[in-house]
C-alpha cells in the first residue's frame, strides 16, 4: 500500500531532504546463493521522484510500466525517466526527479538530495537488486508532510519485490519473460515457495531487511549543504553495529541419491553397493549440517543370482 494518505498538506515553504540508501544485503543475512562474482551482489543507481497522489511510480499488486520493467530487469533508467517527465508535463504530478549513485557491493550507502512541496509531498523510488531477474527494493508514495508540518525524518526497512516481468527463480537466472505479465509482489522467506528461490528460507518467519532508507530534513542555513559521500562500503563505514546484522541460518541442501552402483563382492561374503549425492547448498550461520553423502548397502552380487 502507498505510505501516504489522501490528507491535504498545508505545510509552508518547500522542504529539502537528504535521502540515504543503505544496502544490507550481506552473505551473513542472505547466505543462500549469495552472488560472489559475475556480477557480485550490488545495487543499481537509485531513481526516485517527489510527486502528488496523481502519480504512481510502482505499487504492490499492480502492473509495472514499461519503464519500470526496463529498470527492474536491466537497470536501464532512460524509459522510466521519460515516463516520470511525461507525468510531470501532462499532469504536473511530478515536482522533481532525484537519483543516487549505484552501490558496488551488497552492503554500503549512497545518498542524494530531494525537494518536496505541499502539492508534491510524496516520495517514491526504486533500486534494482543486481544480479536478479526483475527484483528491486523501493518506496511507494511516502508522505513527508504531516498536516501543516514537514516530517523531520523518516526511516524504513526495505524488502525485495518482484516486478512480475521475468520468471527467473534465482539471482543469476537467465532472462525468461513472464507472459502474461504479473503484478508486483513482495518476495518473502516463504513466497515464492519453490526451494530453488534465492530468498526461500523456510525456517524464517520473515526475511531480514535487505536495505534501509533514511530521509532527514535539511535545515536552510547560510552554509551550503554538504551531502554525504555518495558510496560508503560497509566494511569501511558500517553505520549499524555488526552485532545487529542478522545471521540467517542456511540449511544444507543435498541432491537426490544417485542410482545404486554395481554390487561388488562374491557369493560367499556377499557384496556392497554404494550410491552418492552431492551438496547443492553448503550450510551457513548454524544451519542444519549436511547429511552423509555416501551410502553403502549389503547386496547379493549379480553373478550369484
Amino acid at each position: 500500500q502507498p505510505l501516504g494518505g489522501e490528507s491535504i498538506c498545508s505545510a509552508g515553504a518547500p522542504a529539502k531532504y537528504s535521502i540515504t540508501f543503505t544496502g544490507k544485503w550481506s552473505q551473513t543475512a542472505f547466505p543462500k546463493q549469495y552472488p560472489l562474482f559475475r556480477p557480485p551482489a550490488q545495487w543499481s543507481s537509485l531513481l526516485g521522484a517527489a510527486h502528488s497522489s496523481d502519480y504512481s511510480m510502482w505499487r504492490k499488486n499492480q502492473y509495472v510500466s514499461n519503464g519500470l520493467r526496463d529498470f527492474a530487469e536491466r537497470g536501464e533508467a532512460w524509459a522510466l525517466m521519460k515516463e516520470i517527465e511525461a507525468a510531470g508535463e501532462a499532469l504536473q504530478s511530478v515536482h522533481a526527479v532525484f537519483s543516487a549513485p549505484a552501490v558496488p557491493s551488497g552492503t554500503g550507502q549512497t545518498s542524494a538530495e530531494l525537494e518536496v512541496q505541499r502539492r508534491h509531498s510524496l516520495v517514491s523510488f526504486v533500486v534494482r537488486i543486481v544480479p536478479s531477474p526483475d527484483w528491486f527494493v523501493g518506496v511507494d508514495s511516502l508522505d513527508l508532510c504531516d498536516g501543516d508540518r514537514w516530517r523531520e525524518q523518516a526511516a524504513l526497512d526495505l524488502y525485495p519485490y518482484d516486478a512480475g516481468t521475468d520468471s527467473g527463480f534465482t539471482f543469476s537466472s537467465p532472462n525468461f519473460a513472464t507472459i502474461p505479465q504479473d503484478t508486483v509482489t513482495e518476495i518473502t522467506s516463504s513466497s515464492p515457495s519453490h526451494p530453488a528461490n534465492s530468498f526461500y528460507y523456510p525456517r524464517l518467519k520473515a526475511l531480514p531487511p535487505i536495505a534501509r532508507v533514511t530521509l532527514v530534513r535539511l535545515r536552510q542555513s547560510p552554509r551550503a549543504f554538504i551531502p554525504p559521500a555518495p558510496v560508503l562500503p560497509s566494511r569501511d563505514n558500517e553505520i549499524v553495529d555488526s552485532a545487529s546484522v542478522p545471521e540467517t541460518p542456511l540449511d544444507c541442501e543435498v541432491s537426490l541419491w544417485s542410482s545404486w552402483g554395481l554390487c561388488g563382492g562374491h557369493c560367499g561374503r556377499l557384496g556392497t553397493k554404494s550410491r552418492t549425492r552431492y551438496v547443492r547448498v553448503q550450510p551457513a550461520n548454524n544451519g542444519s549440517p549436511c547429511p552423509e553423502l555416501e551410502e553403502e548397502a549389503e547386496c547379493v552380487p549379480d553373478n550369484c543370482v
Epitope: H266, C267, G268, C299, C304
Partner: antibody
Framework: EVQLVQSGGGLVHPGGSLRLSCAGS????????MHWLRQAPGKGLEWVSV???????HYADSVKGRFTISRDNAKNSLYLQMNSLRAEDMAMYYC??????????????????WGQGTMVTVSS | EIVLTQSPGTLSLSPGERATLSCRAS???????LAWYQQKPGQAPRLLIY???SRATGIPDRFSGSGSGTDFTLTISRLEPEDFAVYYC????????FGGGTKVEIK
C-alpha cells in the same frame, strides 16, 4: 572357543515344517555372513542359503519360497525355517560362518567354522 | 552355474606318500575364488585352503593349493594317518558350488 552349535533336526512328514537353530559363540556373531548348507546321505555338499550382516538374504533355487533364513544378533543365533518339506530335502544340515571379516582383511575367505550338523529326515 | 569336476574319485595311497587332487571348473573362476575342504566320516567339513592357495588358520604346511582359471590342485606333500578323508573343492565366484569330492583312502 569359536564354535557353532546346532539344534532342531528330526523326523518330519512330507509337506511338514521344521526349524533349525545355530548358536554362535566365541566371536562377534553380528559381524559375519552366515550360511546354511546340506549334505544328502552319501552325497556331496550343497549350498542352501545365506544371510548377510545387514540382513540381505539369498537362496538356492531348490528351496526358494519354502525356506526362510533369519538371524537374531542379540541371541547370537541363526535360523532356518523349512516349510513344505520334500523327500529330496532329507539331508544333514550344516550352519557355517563365512570367515571374511572387516575391511581389507581376507582372513579365511571361505566357510571357516561349521556347526556339527543336524539331520533332517523327511519320510511318510 | 559353474560345475566343478574332481578327479580322481578315489585316491589310494600310503602314509608318507604325496597326494595330488585335481579340481576342474566348467568356466573360469575369477580372482581364484576357490577353496578346499576336508571331511571325515560323521564330521562337518573343515576348511583347508581359500583363495586357491592360502592356507586357513591352523592348517599344517603339508597342505598346499595352486592353480587359476579352470584348473586347480590340492597337494598333500606327505600323507599322515589323519589325512585320509574326503576332500571337496568349492568355488564362490559365481553362485556357490562344490565338487563331487575325492576320497583319499589308505592303500
Amino acid at each position: 572357543e569359536v564354535q557353532l552349535v546346532q539344534s532342531g533336526g528330526g523326523l518330519v512328514h512330507p509337506g511338514g515344517s521344521l526349524r533349525l537353530s545355530c548358536a554362535g559363540s566365541g566371536f562377534t556373531f553380528s559381524s559375519y555372513v552366515m550360511h546354511w548348507l546340506r549334505q544328502a546321505p552319501g552325497k556331496g555338499l550343497e549350498w542352501v542359503s545365506v544371510i548377510g550382516t545387514g540382513g540381505v538374504t539369498h537362496y538356492a533355487d531348490s528351496v526358494k519360497g519354502r525356506f526362510t533364513i533369519s538371524r537374531d544378533n542379540a541371541k547370537n543365533s541363526l535360523y532356518l525355517q523349512m516349510n513344505s518339506l520334500r523327500a529330496e530335502d532329507m539331508a544333514m544340515y550344516y550352519c557355517a560362518r563365512w570367515g571374511y571379516y572387516g575391511s581389507g582383511s581376507y582372513e579365511n575367505d571361505a566357510f571357516d567354522i561349521w556347526g556339527q550338523g543336524t539331520m533332517v529326515t523327511v519320510s511318510s | 552355474e559353474i560345475v566343478l569336476t574332481q578327479s580322481p574319485g578315489t585316491l589310494s595311497l600310503s602314509p608318507g606318500e604325496r597326494a595330488t587332487l585335481s579340481c576342474r571348473a566348467s568356466q573360469s573362476v575369477s580372482s581364484s575364488y576357490l577353496a578346499w575342504y576336508q571331511q571325515k566320516p560323521g564330521q562337518a567339513p573343515r576348511l583347508l585352503i581359500y583363495g586357491a592357495s592360502s592356507r586357513a588358520t591352523g592348517i599344517p604346511d603339508r597342505f598346499s593349493g595352486s592353480g587359476s582359471g579352470t584348473d586347480f590342485t590340492l597337494t598333500i606333500s606327505r600323507l599322515e594317518p589323519e589325512d585320509f578323508a574326503v576332500y571337496y573343492c568349492q568355488q564362490y565366484s559365481s553362485s556357490l558350488t562344490f565338487g563331487g569330492g575325492t576320497k583319499v583312502e589308505i592303500k
